[in-house]
């Protein structure tokens, strides 16, 4: 029950996270004009990964796509790539995890297959979350660098005079959405990986009847191998030898007339 809950919660958390990553990628407010020195501005500039927008004092907003690829900074291209990779991996992960859910029965799918699928989707979610966090962090670093560069440019002009005020940019809402979404996807992925361990089938001992050979004190149990999935502790498939004549479930078998051949 706890495994199903962990898996289900991991799926839901990852789903919310991936939806957030998609939202952040599409949002226009990755960088917003810094209004620290001029809180009542007639023009407000902000940019996303795909277009640049201007909101004017009358309320009119104009957005313009980046119609150039070569003119864009390499960092911006890298961020775009990271976010898209994150979305693609997350989407595939969601698809895999739907079939891996314990509460959903598909044909005669074994628990070991579900466990493997849960682990796969968990890893995909972790990588997806890391891609989103990395993408947002790279963009944030680019903003911080440019912010201090433009601040320096503002006050170092010809003869120390203040130049035309350069627009400075600060963190937009999309960055925070991206960080949170990436974190959620990462947590969801970890939960799926934890659930995978619990989904693995338990090791089972096959019951066997022991036969006494005359004059021997050790009974050999045919088929006395422990079946293992590889997830449990008995991975060496040791043969089980027993000193007494007992069945697997420790019930004493007494000598009968058929014991001696």
């Amino acid at each position: 029950m706890a495994v199903t809950a962990c898996q289900g919660l991991g799926f839901v958390v990852s789903l919310i996270g991936i939806a957030g990553i998609i939202a952040a990628t599409c949002m226009d407010q990755w960088s917003t004009q810094d209004l620290y020195n001029n809180p009542v501005t007639a023009v407000f500039n902000y940019q996303g990964l795909w277009r640049s927008c201007v909101r004017e004092s009358s309320g009119f907003t104009e957005c313009r796509g980046y119609f150039t690829l070569l003119g864009l900074p390499a960092m911006l291209q890298a961020v775009r790539a990271l976010m898209i990779v994150g979305i693609v991996l997350g989407a595939i992960g969601l698809l895999v995890s739907i079939f891996a859910l314990k509460c959903i029965r598909i044909g005669s799918m074994e628990d070991s297959a579900k466990a493997n699928m849960t682990l796969t989707s968990g890893i995909m979610f972790i990588v997806s979350g890391l891609c989103a966090i990395a993408g947002v962090s790279v963009f944030a670093n680019m903003l911080v660098t440019n912010f201090w560069m433009s601040t320096a440019n503002m006050y170092t002009g010809m003869g120390g005079m203040v130049q035309t005020v350069q627009t400075r940019y600060t963190f937009g809402a999309a960055l925070f959405v991206g960080w949170v979404a990436g974190g959620l996807t990462l947590i969801g992925g970890v939960m799926m990986c934890i659930a995978c361990r619990g989904l693995a089938p338990e090791e089972t001992n096959y019951k066997a009847v022991s036969y006494h050979a005359s004059g021997h004190s050790v009974a050999y149990k045919p088929g006395g191998f422990k079946a293992s999935t590889g997830f449990g502790s008995n991975t060496k498939n040791k043969k089980i030898y027993d000193g007494g004549a007992r069945t697997e479930d420790e019930v004493q078998s007494y000598p009968s007339k058929h014991d001696y051949v």
Partner: nanobody, 123 residues
Framework: AVQLVESGGDLVQAGGSLRLSCAAS????????MGWYRQAPGNQRELVAM???????NYADSVKGRFTLFRENNKNTVHLQMNSLKPEDTGVYYC?????????????????WGQGTHVTVSS
């Protein structure tokens, strides 16, 4: 830098017509809005008409049906055609433009104002 140059201001009789022009020059990579504001003596500066990049035009209620704002084809110039002028239309008319004047990928927009042109409507 961007410069806005207004022209067309004059003294005119009530009921007459006048055309104001505003030409933008400099590093222009597209305009966001372009329009006219006026300031009557002792009053605040108010919007007269505004043209957006999407093609919509907004007018002040007091000038609707009398004034027409339009942009010259493929030019960074807007004209304000003023008909049926009234004495209350008197004032200094300022051209205002929000222009993308940054060549970088960000294409920052800034606000620019002209020096103003005087319009006097006598009764």
């Amino acid at each position: 830098a961007v410069q806005l140059v207004e022209s067309g201001g004059d003294l005119v009789q009530a009921g007459g017509s006048l055309r104001l022009s505003c030409a933008a020059s400099g590093s222009i990579f597209g305009f966001v809005v372009m329009g006219w504001y006026r300031q009557a003596p002792g009053n605040q500066r108010e919007l007269v008409a505004m043209l957006t990049s999407s093609g919509t035009t907004n007018y002040a209620d007091s000038v609707k049906g009398r004034f027409t704002l339009f942009r010259e084809n493929n030019k960074n110039t807007v004209h304000l055609q003023m008909n049926s002028l009234k004495p209350e239309d008197t004032g200094v008319y300022y051209c205002r433009a929000v222009i993308r004047s940054d060549s970088s990928w960000r294409a920052d927009a800034n606000e620019y104002w002209g020096q103003g042109t005087h319009v006097t409507v006598s009764s």
